[in-house]
Every structure is written in structure tokens, then in C-alpha cells.
């Protein structure tokens, strides 16, 4: 009896949808493994008789459930198979956006850039499958524990009136905010000011 | 249910032009992205081209980047694709494809309607 796949789960993010999943100890031999998708009520084959213990499935349509299985195989026999089922506008995980930072005097003048998605044309991107797509933004006095959030309205933001030749440090996230669903963090960006814009009179 | 009718195909030269219809019965406002996709002979589906309804943006294939533009008249319920400075690789059956959906743009999982296509011959 061949023993199944262990720990099958999908990895998604920004669609990018990798089946993953466990060899399991097998003394026999090496296993292969099939992954399927269930379209028209039909399983279709995605990877057949692999060594890998992943399969790509970011062709899939981004709505609705879809089931996927996997199985091992080894010579003539096969393990049962396991299913999951995936939706992936519900459950791809929103990777961090892109950020771009300028220092103007005591501001710091930021551009958001939506996260890319796998399979897509260039300027297609997670703004425009998530239609409440928004930006949260924190901000900190590097060295300090407090953190200040925002939510841009648009794809860029300002923060003025900084303090003058301090180091502030950014990230930004994607945020749904009809779905309450919160993307990751970017990587903080640190950058220090400069002189107060101010003119003393 | 949308039925989608392409027409404007046909031979052409080398670095001439050709403007294709899909005319979509029904509200085509109703179905949030409306695709072009194009099938060369002997070669899989490629996506060329989405325009999405509500904020009218659109998206292009690398390979047809300033030369192919998207358009929708919603007053018509038809959209158009005008492709320029044709080369021989451009040569397909192209095909219009509505999302009901709208979550995406290049995939064909993504899009529920076809048309039954029509074909582009570039060739002197």
C-alpha cells in the first residue's frame, strides 16, 4: 500500500498558487506524485508522475472554489488521493507592495505600487482584481517603539513637518478593507530628513 | 447570457492596420473586463489585450505594446481592437472573451464568454 502525500496545503500568493506537500516515508523506493484540478466535473492532470513535491496552479481562474488532489505513486500502485479545496481571491495572501521613498526637507514624500500577480499582464495588479484596494502606511522615529499609522487615499502620500535631520522609517501594506483582510508589510524604508523648509523671519 | 460576435479580420500586409469589432448582445457593461486572446497556427491561446469597464484601463501583451490599442463604445455595447504596423507573427484567429467576474485580465480561466473568432492573415 502506498502511503499518501502528508501536510498538503496550497502556498498563494498574489496568486501565484503552489500546491505543496510532504513525501511520506516510503521503504519501497522513491515515490512520484500526480496533482489534479477538477474542471467541468472532470480531473484534469497539472503535474503527472513527478518527483517534486509542488505543483503551480496560477493558471487556475482567480474566482470560485476549485479542487485540487494529489497522490503518490510508485510503479503500479497509488496512494488514495488528497483533496483541498482553494478559492483563490479569498485566500491568496497579499504580498507587500512596492514603495518608493523621497526626502524633501522635514517631508517625506512616498509612491505606492501595487503588487505584480502571476500570470498577468504588467499594469494588471491586485488594485485592480480587489475594487475597496487600499494602502495602510506606518511610520516611525527610528530608535523609537511608537508607530503612527495612515491611510493614503491615493497611491502616494506626503508626511510633512517632520522633525529636521531625524531618520524616519516607512512601510506600507495592502489592505481590503470590505473584506477586513490585511496584507503583509513591506520591508521598512529608513531615510533621515533634512533642514526645516521654515524661513526665519 | 453574452453571446460575442468578432468581425474585421482579413489579409493585410505587412505594416498595414486592421480594426476589430466584438459586438456583445446583452448590457456588455454587465461583464466587468472584455479580453482579446489570439490563437497562431499550431500554437496554444495568448492573451493580447483587456479593458476593464469601470475604470476603462487598459492592458496590453509585451508583444503588442504601442502597436495594438483596446477600446469600448458601451453605447454600442462593442469593443475594438486597432492594431498597427502588423507583422507576419500576428497572424491568428482572434478571439473576444467577457469576465463575468473581472478579477482578471490575461489568463483565459478567467473569462466565461467566447466568441468564435476571426482570422488575421498578415503575409505579402
Known amino acids: 500500500m502506498v502511503p499518501p502525500p502528508e501536510n498538503v496545503r496550497m502556498n498563494s500568493v498574489n496568486f501565484k498558487n503552489i500546491l505543496q506537500w510532504e513525501s511520506p516515508a516510503f521503504a519501497k523506493g522513491n515515490l512520484t506524485f500526480t496533482a489534479q484540478y477538477l474542471s467541468y466535473r472532470i480531473f484534469q492532470d497539472k503535474c503527472m508522475n513527478t518527483t517534486l513535491t509542488e505543483c503551480d496552479f496560477s493558471s487556475l481562474s482567480k474566482y470560485g472554489d476549485h479542487t485540487l488532489r494529489v497522490r503518490a505513486e510508485f510503479a503500479d500502485e497509488h496512494s488514495d488521493w488528497v483533496n483541498i479545496t482553494f478559492c483563490p481571491v479569498d485566500d491568496t495572501i497579499i504580498g507587500p507592495p512596492g514603495m518608493q521613498v523621497e526626502v524633501l526637507a522635514d517631508s517625506l514624500h512616498m509612491r505606492f505600487l501595487a503588487p505584480k500577480i502571476e500570470n498577468e499582464y504588467e499594469t494588471w495588479t491586485m488594485k485592480n482584481v480587489y475594487n475597496s484596494w487600499t494602502y495602510n502606511v506606518q511610520y516611525w522615529k527610528n530608535g523609537t517603539d511608537e508607530k503612527f499609522q495612515i491611510t493614503p487615499q491615493y497611491d502616494f502620500e506626503v508626511l510633512r513637518n517632520l522633525e529636521p535631520w531625524t531618520t524616519y522609517c516607512v512601510q506600507v501594506r495592502g489592505f481590503l478593507p470590505d473584506r477586513n483582510k490585511a496584507g503583509e508589510w513591506s520591508e521598512p524604508v529608513c531615510e533621515q530628513t533634512t533642514h526645516d523648509e521654515t524661513v526665519p523671519s | 447570457e453574452v453571446q460575442l460576435v468578432e468581425s474585421g479580420g482579413g489579409l493585410v500586409q505587412p505594416g498595414g492596420s486592421l480594426r476589430l469589432s466584438c459586438a456583445a448582445s446583452g448590457n456588455s457593461l454587465d461583464y466587468p473586463t472584455i479580453g482579446w486572446f489570439r490563437q497562431a497556427p499550431g500554437k496554444g491561446l495568448e492573451g493580447v489585450s483587456c479593458i476593464s469597464a469601470s475604470e476603462g484601463s487598459t492592458h496590453y501583451a509585451d508583444a503588442v505594446k504601442g502597436r495594438f490599442t483596446i477600446s469600448r463604445d458601451n453605447s454600442k455595447n462593442t469593443v475594438y481592437l486597432q492594431m498597427n504596423s502588423l507583422r507576419a507573427e500576428d497572424t491568428a484567429v482572434y478571439y473576444c472573451?467577457?469576465?463575468?467576474?473581472?478579477?482578471?485580465?490575461?489568463?483565459?480561466?478567467?473569462?466565461?464568454?467566447w466568441g468564435q473568432g476571426t482570422m488575421v492573415t498578415v503575409s505579402s
Open positions: 472573451a467577457a469576465s463575468g467576474h473581472g478579477l482578471g485580465c490575461k489568463s483565459e480561466a478567467d473569462y466565461d464568454y
